[in-house]
């Protein structure tokens, strides 16, 4: 009796179970009553990453330098090329089809997490006791200067954008 279902890595065709082509190869001809499935390797710049019965291999992704992309990992016959962004840029999506410049954190905000090739800068407001007076993609919030440890006193209070200003203590005559 002809099968109605096949094992893993097989497919049903013409009432018989044929082996799927292994990753890196495409289907040329179905198996016959005499022979196994006929498969061929994917060409240069092509890949298939699963056991399959595909008649065409997929083209490797192109990392377009005009979009700020570069190759992070070269593709093989079994894997696609992985793109990432040039220094200072990050991917706009998980598929990394284009890049945008890392965002900078404005004064009053510091960098919580530095950007990577796939994620943007994460900023956080500087809490009380901390400040940032620059727009930067790297600088964290800095703590206010401690006047006391320098035997000085606060002459001007700090904000989230400015440091405290220290000055000498008034001498009692």
């Amino acid at each position: 009796e002809p099968p109605t279902a096949c094992r893993e890595k097989q497919y049903l065709i013409n009432s018989q179970c044929c082996s799927l082509c292994q990753p890196g190869q495409k289907l040329v001809s179905d198996c016959t009553e005499f022979t196994e499935t006929e498969c061929l390797p994917c060409g240069e710049s092509e890949f298939l990453d699963t056991w399959n019965r595909e008649t065409h291999c997929h083209q490797h992704k192109y990392c377009d330098p005009n979009l700020g992309l570069r190759v992070q990992q070269k593709g093989t016959s079994e894997t696609d090329t992985i793109c990432t962004c040039e220094e200072g840029w990050h991917c706009t999506s998980e598929a990394c089809e284009s890049c945008v410049l890392h965002r900078s954190c404005s004064p009053g905000f510091g960098v919580k997490q530095i950007a990577t090739g796939v994620s943007d800068t994460i900023c956080e407001p500087c809490p009380v006791g901390f400040f940032s007076n620059v727009s930067s993609a790297f600088e964290k919030c800095h703590p206010w200067t401690s006047c006391e440890t320098k035997d000085l006193v606060v002459q001007q209070a700090g904000t989230n954008k400015t440091d405290v200003v220290c000055g000498p203590q008034d001498r009692l005559r």
Partner: antibody, heavy 116, light 111 residues
Amino acid sequence: QVQLVQSGGGLVQPGGSLRLSCAASGFTFSSNWMSWVRQAPGKGLEWVANINQDGSEKYYVDSVKGRFTISRDNAKNSLYLQLNSLRAEDTAEYYCARGGYRYAYWGQGTLVTVSS
Amino acid sequence: QSALTQPASVSGSPGQSITISCTGTSSDVGGYNYVSWYQQHPGKAPKLIIYDVTNRPSGVSNRFSGSKSANTASLTISGLQAEDEADYYCSSYTSSSTLVFGGGTELTVLG
């Protein structure tokens, strides 16, 4: 069962044209590469051409490039070989075969004779 | 696209073993495990007897076996029988996505 039934051979003058056909049955024609192989009288086998499942890939032996065209009609389960600008050295038995590079099934063959 | 090189003829007595060689290049035989062997009796279409270097189609006698070393493939027929008398052809897939056959070997079974 698998069958490949050929037609279209015959006698043709040098420079003439001919179209060979191969009607397939007993298998899923559209998921298989197909090929043509020829054999001159008293000589060995010579691979001529093959075509992929949807006709987007076609390959030919150098000696027939630009003169022969392989094609297929998946709706009709048929394979074709158009022979143009025929030469005496194209005289041979032409076989269609199922597959891209190995052939478990062959047509019965059709004789093409190029002679004036 | 040069034909693969096979001996023009080989012979052997019934019961003996014979080997037919098939020599190509690194762009065909040596580069892929896609070597096939065909048996052809006079006036008949070829019959596949070995594929992918070593695989035997179901129904083909286990007296037929295939192997490959570098750019040379071989077909061995053991326990030679009268019905083995035929022409034998090797073929190989090539780096230019084409196929090439050997020139053929005529096998004579003596006696």
